[in-house]
Interface confidence: medium
């Protein structure tokens, strides 16, 4: 399908002008290539009428032009002095007329209505309000005022000053007679319907002295605003319906093939399941306007959208609406990234978030989509640091790999972490993306102690066991803080024979703290990565305490990675069994809040690993 997009139908009246905007993917080639507007003939050929290279056909001379806006990826064709002969089928496109990078546009030019002399024309959108002004002479001031609608040769009474209201206008029309001295009465019609379209007659008095004024009311369906967005990107519909409906329920709906409108979201709590996790209805402003954000755009999201107001929270005739025609460009600049990331309870996920690579300095954010209250998104972490304290020790936002992608790592997963998360920046809002985290059955691949109590001044060795599939990955330990995870210095011992054969005993990377200080207290992560792409992580909390007398419970300060056959040494001192390495009951129960101000560093902390080879791929 062509990525060029424009209005499908354009209608106007003889003598008027039209402006037709066409969109294209703003690639370097597209920005500079020829743009054209051509008319389709009976033979199927498309004859150029105007192009960006300065050509204007004789038929269009002096009344048409084409302007390219390469920075926006749009071009505009303006045609003036329209005649009935301009009605027909056209194409706006790029390159050669026959190449297919084009969009079909139907132009219909109709004859303007023949109106009686002195007719006032009122042009109003459906659902809005019109005020018809009706002048009269002094002698008719005390006489009956009325508004009629002309239907064929007959005139049907709509409203008069004797309190008659036509049933078709019930509860939405009023006639206002001003105070003395003002020789004008007004008729206000609210919530205009398409059927209200037509010629009206104001009348004051009767007989030959009566005052009459014709009014032509043109009720228009709102012209849809064209919206051109990239696949996987984000769109925002700003809906301004006016103060008169400020306190009425609002909705966004999508027009279906039956020309009815399916609610996408409304302020009464309804939401289409197809938009679960990727839609927010932002609260309305004091003027009654509101906005709807949709992320993770799909090709099937294309179509005509209407926003409106009605107490039922859905489309009803005669209520104000606003319209958009959404086109989703498949030649997207937004890279593919997983829309679903799976993790196991106790394990971790590493989420890749795209951003506009031109905005590398932008602030990065990650928020958790909540379905309550029309959708909202509390920030969890940003590139400046952690936002929500309940994620302490298990969430980090990394600028890597960079060049249009940042990484968010979440570990110590529970079933409550399942849900939709949004990747955001303070730059180009079209790059908002959505990822769903699913918690599946399984065991974490990296095994670390549940938590560890270290003894001040002694040596602590924390093991991290990994499976063979991570043998070629880079292994690391880092100390978590609310601004990131500081990698600890590594002592590479080089690949051993045992490691090449993925020996049982070699699948281990250990963190050594020697000697343990108060500043070492906090969260530590063991992880695997491949270059700048992060895989799984496992977290362990290290509490630091004074040396205790015999009988107190602590992990052996000399080593926390005992061999599989080691057992309880005495009533209080227990070493870690390999198969139970995740069992937190083997460690001190207390969980001390991490001091994130100081980092473990220097030669006191070291990481022992059997390999320094590069990571072979992401763990998820």
């Amino acid at each position: 399908k062509s990525p060029v997009f424009g209005p499908q139908e354009v209608s106007s009246v003889e003598g008027n002008s039209v402006s037709i905007k066409c969109y294209y993917p703003p690639t370097s080639v597209n920005r500079h290539t020829r743009k054209y507007w051509c008319r389709k003939g009976a033979s199927g050929r498309c004859i150029t009428l105007v192009s960006s290279e300065g050509y204007v056909s004789s038929n269009y001379a002096g009344r048409a032009n084409l302007t390219n806006f390469p920075e926006n990826g749009t071009f505009v064709v303006n045609i003036a002095q329209l005649s009935r002969d301009d009605s027909g089928h056209y194409k706006c496109g790029l390159g050669i007329n026959s190449r297919g990078l084009s969009f079909d546009v139907s132009l219909e030019v109709s004859q303007g209505p023949e109106l009686p002399n002195g007719t006032e024309v009122y042009t109003v959108d459906v659902g809005r309000t019109v005020t018809i002004k009706c002048p009269f002479k002094t002698e008719n001031a005390p006489k009956t005022k009325a508004l009629y609608k002309k239907i064929g040769q007959t005139s049907v009474l709509v409203i008069d000053s004797r309190n008659y209201v036509n049933p078709n206008y019930k509860d939405r029309i009023r006639l206002r007679i001003p105070g003395t001295g003002q020789l004008i009465f007004t008729v206000v019609i609210d919530r205009l319907r398409l059927s209200d379209h037509g010629l009206y007659l104001c009348q004051a008095g009767d007989g030959s002295n009566r005052d009459e004024k014709n009014a032509d009311l043109q009720v228009l369906e709102p012209e849809p605003e064209l919206v051109y967005e990239d696949l996987r990107g984000s769109v925002t519909f700003h809906c301004a319906l006016g103060l008169e409906v400020a306190n009425v329920a609002k909705f966004l709906c999508r027009v279906n093939s039956r020309e009815t409108c399916d609610v996408v979201i409304n302020t009464l709590g309804k939401r289409d399941s197809a938009f679960e996790g990727r839609i927010l209805l932002n609260p309305q402003d004091k003027d009654g306007s509101f906005s709807v954000v949709i992320t993770g755009l799909r090709k099937e999201d294309e179509g005509r959208y209407l926003c409106g107001a009605h107490s039922d929270g859905q489309l009803q005739e005669g209520w104000p609406i606003q319209a958009w025609q959404l086109f989703v460009n498949e030649e997207s600049t937004i890279p593919r990234s997983p829309t679903v990331v799976k993790g196991v309870a106790g394990g971790s996920v590493a989420v890749l978030c795209p951003y506009n690579p031109k905005e590398s300095q932008s602030l990065k954010y990650w928020c958790l989509w909540e379905g309550a209250q029309n959708g909202r998104c509390p920030l969890l972490v940003e590139s400046q640091g952690l936002v929500q304290e309940q994620y302490e020790g298990r969430l980090s936002l990394l600028q890597e790999p960079g060049n249009g992608t940042f990484t968010v790592i979440l570990n110590q997963l529970t079933t409550q972490d399942a849900g939709f998360y949004w990747c955001l920046t303070n730059g180009d809002t079209r790059w908002r993306t959505t990822v769903e985290i699913k918690i599946i059955e399984g065991e974490p691949n990296l095994k670390v102690p549940g938590n560890v109590t270290a003894v001040l001044g002694e040596t602590l060795n924390i093991p991290c066991h990994f499976p063979c599939k991570f043998s070629s990955y880079e292994k690391y330990w880092c100390k978590w803080s609310n601004t990131g995870c500081q990698t600890l210095p590594s002592q590479d011992e080089g690949p051993s024979e045992a490691f090449v054969n993925c020996d049982e005993n070699s699948r281990l990377v250990s963190l050594t703290l020697n000697p343990v200080t108060r500043a070492d207290e906090g969260w530590y992560w063991c992880g695997v990565k491949q270059g700048h792409f992060y895989g799984e992580t496992a977290a362990v909390y290290v509490a630091v305490e004074e040396k205790k007398v015999a009988g107190s419970r602590y992990v052996s300060p000399a080593k926390a990675d005992a061999a599989p056959d080691e057992k309880v040494l005495d009533s209080g001192v227990r070493e870690i069994e390999n198969k139970a390495i995740q069992d937190p009951r083997l460690f001190a129960e207390e969980k001390v809040v991490a001091d994130t101000g100081d980092q473990a560093g220097g030669s006191r902390a070291s990481v022992d690993s059997s390999s320094s080879e590069e990571q072979g791929g992401s763990s998820k």
Epitope: P283, L363, Q388
Partner: nanobody, 124 residues
Amino acid sequence: QVQLVESGGGLVQAGGSLRLSCAASGRTIYGYVMGWFRQAPGKEREFVARIDWSGSSTDYADSVKGRFTISRDNAKNTVYLQMNSLKPEDTAVYYCAGSAYYSGYVTHRDFGSWGQGTQVTVSS
């Protein structure tokens, strides 16, 4: 959390105007919904106004609609409350607050960062 400091309060006659400022430090307020609350002597703290992350959506208490305007300058990391046609009943300590919600409906309970407040006194 973001640190907030209010300024611009003072004594003003009924019908007069004041502009309160709220300067944020510690981190940018871009992703935050920001709000103003007030507490009159012997009364509970009440909502005055809020503004979303982009400044495109605002909301006001009925008692201040049409008189107060909330705005923000993300580049300056500052939120403002322009108060016109002040009334004696507007006398209170005004607090600036931040809520770490990028978007969507935010209830008053969701505001987690608070300033120390600035006194506004309107004399009749």
